[in-house]
Each structure stands twice: as structure tokens, then as C-alpha cells.
């Protein structure tokens, strides 16, 4: 019971980070128009990964894209870049976690099949989650540069007349949803990577075990103990041979395939 | 078509308290910011400041805070000006107008005079 | 504050002339995010209420003759009357629209002989 809600948990903490790594990529606050200077601004800035907007105190939101791949920042690139690979290594993720949940009977899946999807979909997650939290990091990066860069230039007189004030960016609400985001499938994967330990079949647990006949010999087939008595009466000796890792009505809710002969 | 009808001019004395309206028709009175400007006789445009038009909340210009307020009845269509212990140099035109793209005002009230004289 | 210098005060032309005015901002007062001077041309004619001419520094509004054109970029506006009319006669003002307060220059009073 508790592997399953690992990994139906894992699912869902997946799912939701998932979520908000595609929502942080497709947000325009990325930066937002640092307002330390001016808290009541008339024109509002605001940039994202894919295109930068302005609203004015009018209400009037306009937002241009950026139609060049050349002309962008290398930094913006390889931003956008593991943004894009941590969303499609979680969708894979998200895809395959399906197949594996143990709640969800596919066919005759073996146990083992879905242990290995599980610790797959796992290191997705996980993955997708280090893309995430490193191009959030990157970003955030590349904003406290510029920032310091643009504090050192903030006034630039000309003949000590006209103020030319330049327009400083801080971190946008996106930065703060990527970072979350990143961490719960993070999360998610490590819990899915946890759950994938408590599926591994019985037989990969026997072969771990030395065994010393005491007297009358046992023949162990590879369906494990209950496999060679026809039914499931000797749960009670389980113990013995998986070195105590499940409970009793654990090994009950999972049945293996012999058990429906 | 879009208007911004004020109410008529006002004959005050000093001390008094004048409320000037401002009826907004041809579009919806919470989707754009409003605007007050004065124009005392002869001179040029001041802008005294805006009204939000999503959360009512008043923005004011340095030398009109304190005796001005600015307010929304959303019901009404209406905007008002109000300003208490008139002076003489309060004595002007005063304008309602939308803020719209731009940043500019892009329709203005016909104009309210006010007359402070003792 | 932004402060809006216009030149000159007052203007004296014939109809038919071409006339252009000035207006300088203590500030640029083009926005980085758009690329947009923000920068409004007023009218206003004797007794009557401004009218908006032109914004974005150089985008004329709807109903507005094209004898009237923006121009200037960051500190430095222009605007011009290509040939003057007699119904052209009003004050014209410039308005800062980039930072609050929104502040107007002068004006600059167009007279016809």
C-alpha cells in the first residue's frame, strides 16, 4: 500500500510541477520593470522567453516577439532550450509513469516491467526538473548581471542636462513558478525513483538472500514461495526470504503473475 | 460616440467646498483611467491626477494633494472632483478626460470654470 | 518630474505656410521595451477643450488632417503643420505620457495674419 501511494504521489507531484514548468516557459514575467526608482510607473516593461510587453497605465498591453533566432542572446537560447528539453523529458516521463502505476493493470505487465518504468519515469522527472531549476537559475543569473551592469549606468547626463534613466529588470513572477516547479518534479521523481524499489519483484530479492537447508530440502521455483505450494498460505514465513522489506497485506495486494494459473 | 459631460460652472467662496462631476457615455467608465487637468485663465494645462478605473484608487499630482480628492461611482457613470477650503488661486477650468493608449487623453470633459471670490 | 520646454511661445504665419514646432523633455522619453517615444501632441482651440492630435510622438489619430505630423526621437519633439489653415488657430501642446506626473510644456500659440 505504501509503494502505491509513493508512486501514485510521485505521479502527482510530477504532474503538477510538469504543469508549471510548461506554464513558467510560456509566461511573459520572466523580468519584470524594476520599480525601486519609480513605484508608480506610466509604462510598465515586461520580458518572457518568447516575447517582451509593455503596459501602460492605460491599460494598453502591447507585446512584440522576437522574431530573430540569431539576433537573441545566447544565454536566452540555452534558457529556452532546457526549458523545452525539461518539458519533454516530463511529458515522456508523465507518459511512461502512467503505464507504470501500479493502481493501473495493463494486460500481464510484470511487476518488474513496471519497476523499471517506474525508476524511468523517475529519472525523467528528475532530470526535467534539474533542466528546469537550471534555466530558471541561468535566467535569474543573467538578470542580477545585467542589473548591477545597468545600476553602475543607471544615469548617464548629457551636459548635465537631459537624464537618460535606463530601464533595469528584476526577477518576474516565472523565475519563482520555474523554480517551484522544478523542485516538485524533482520531487516527484525522486519518490517515483523510492516506489521503483518497493516494486522490484519477489525473485530479485531470493537472489540476494544466502540460503542454508536445515534439514528438508525445498525446491524454489521462480514464482517465489506461494508459487510452490499452489497458493498463497505461507505468507506467514515471507519475511524469511525478503529480509522483512514489505508486510504481510502488502505482499497480498500484489499479486504476481502465478497467482491466476 | 464617447463623451465626458461635466456639470456647470460654480460661483464658490473662499473656505467653501465645490464637487464637480463628470458623466462618462459610448463606453464603460471602469475600463479606462480618468483624468483631471486644470487651466487657470490664460494659463496652460496642469495635470492634477488620475483615478484607476479598476480599483477607484486616486493618484495626485504634488501640488494637488490634500484639499482635492478624486472619486468613481461606477453606477452612475460618473466621476467627481472634489475640493474643500477653496482659495482664490483655485480659481481655473477644470477638465475631465480618459486616459487611453498611449498614455494620453484621448476625449476631455467640455470643462467646469469654478470662481473662488470673496 | 519631467520638465516639457516648448518653443516658441507664440507663432505668426500665413495660411498655406508650413510650420513646425518644438518641444524638448528633461528626459528621454522613449520606453526601451517598445521602442515608443511617449509624447502627445495637443490642440486647443480659443474656448474649447484640448484635442488629441498625436501620440506615440509620431501616430496620428483617427480624424486628424495629414498636414499634421509627429516627429523626434528620446528628448527632441517636432511637430508640424504642413500647410497652415485657417482653422488651424489654437494653442498646441506636448504632453510627457512615460512617467507620472504627466506633465505639459507651455504651449505654443499659432496665430494667422
Known amino acids: 500500500m505504501a509503494v502505491t501511494a509513493c508512486q501514485g504521489l510521485g505521479f502527482v507531484v510530477s504532474l503538477i510541477g510538469i504543469a508549471g514548468i510548461i506554464a513558467a516557459t510560456c509566461m511573459d514575467q520572466w523580468s519584470t520593470q524594476d520599480l525601486y526608482n519609480n513605484p508608480v510607473t506610466a509604462v510598465f516593461n515586461y520580458q518572457g522567453l518568447w516575447r517582451s510587453c509593455v503596459r501602460e497605465s492605460s491599460g494598453f498591453t502591447e507585446c512584440r516577439g522576437y522574431f530573430t533566432l540569431l539576433g537573441l542572446p545566447a544565454m536566452l537560447q540555452a534558457v529556452r532550450a532546457l526549458m523545452i528539453v525539461g518539458i519533454v523529458l516530463g511529458a515522456i516521463g508523465l507518459l511512461v509513469s502512467i503505464f507504470a502505476l501500479k493502481c493501473i493493470r495493463i494486460g500481464s505487465m510484470e511487476d518488474s516491467a513496471k519497476a523499471n518504468m517506474t525508476l524511468t519515469s523517475g529519472i525523467m522527472f528528475i532530470v526535467s526538473g534539474l533542466c528546469a531549476i537550471a534555466g530558471v537559475s541561468v535566467f535569474a543569473n543573467m538578470l542580477v548581471t545585467n542589473f548591477w551592469m545597468s545600476t553602475a549606468n543607471m544615469y548617464t547626463g548629457m551636459g548635465g542636462m537631459v537624464q537618460t534613466v535606463q530601464t533595469r529588470y528584476t526577477f518576474g513572477a516565472a523565475l519563482f513558478v520555474g523554480w517551484v516547479a522544478g523542485g516538485l518534479t524533482l520531487i516527484g521523481g525522486v519518490m517515483m525513483c523510492i516506489a521503483c524499489r518497493g516494486l522490484a519483484p519477489e525473485e530479485t530479492n531470493y537472489k540476494a538472500v544466502s540460503y542454508h537447508a536445515s534439514g528438508h530440502s525445498v525446491a524454489y521455483k521462480p514464482g517465489g514461495f506461494k508459487a510452490s505450494t499452489g497458493f498463497g498460505s505461507n505468507t506467514k514465513n515471507k519475511k524469511i526470504y525478503d529480509g522483512g522489506a514489505r508486510t504481510e497485506d502488502e505482499v497480498q495486494s500484489y499479486p504476481s503473475k502465478h497467482d491466476y494459473v | 460616440q464617447i463623451q465626458l459631460v461635466q456639470s456647470g460652472p460654480e460661483l464658490k467662496k473662499p473656505g467653501e467646498t465645490v464637487k464637480i462631476s463628470c458623466k462618462a457615455s459610448?463606453?464603460?467608465?471602469?475600463?479606462?483611467?480618468m483624468n483631471w487637468v486644470r487651466q487657470a485663465p490664460g494659463k496652460g494645462l496642469k495635470w492634477m491626477g488620475w483615478i484607476r478605473p479598476n480599483t477607484g484608487e486616486p493618484t495626485y499630482a504634488e501640488d494637488f494633494k490634500g484639499r482635492f480628492v478624486f472619486s468613481l461611482e461606477t453606477s452612475a457613470a460618473t466621476a467627481y472632483l472634489q475640493i474643500t477650503n477653496l482659495k482664490s488661486e483655485d480659481t481655473s477650468t477644470y477638465f475631465c478626460a480618459r486616459l487611453y493608449r498611449g498614455n494620453t487623453l484621448d476625449n476631455w470633459g467640455q470643462g467646469t470654470s469654478v470662481i473662488v471670490s470673496s | 518630474d519631467i520638465v516639457m520646454t516648448q518653443s516658441p511661445s507664440s507663432l505668426t504665419v500665413t495660411t498655406g505656410e508650413k510650420v513646425t514646432m518644438s518641444c524638448k523633455s528633461s528626459?528621454?522619453?522613449?520606453?526601451?521595451?517598445?521602442?515608443?517615444?511617449?509624447l502627445t501632441w495637443y490642440q486647443q482651440k480659443p474656448g474649447q477643450s484640448p484635442k488629441l492630435l498625436i501620440y506615440w510622438a509620431s501616430t496620428r489619430e483617427s480624424g486628424v488632417p495629414y498636414r499634421f505630423t509627429g516627429s523626434g526621437s528620446g528628448t527632441d519633439f517636432t511637430l508640424t503643420i504642413s500647410s497652415v489653415q485657417t482653422d488651424d488657430l489654437a494653442i498646441y501642446y506636448c504632453?510627457?505620457?512615460?512617467?507620472?506626473?504627466?506633465?505639459f510644456g507651455s504651449g505654443t500659440k499659432l496665430e494667422i495674419k
Open positions: 459610448g463606453y464603460t467608465l471602469t475600463n479606462y483611467g
Open positions: 528626459q528621454n522619453l522613449l520606453n526601451s521595451g517598445n521602442q515608443r517615444n511617449y
Open positions: 504632453q510627457n505620457g512615460y512617467s507620472f506626473p504627466f506633465t
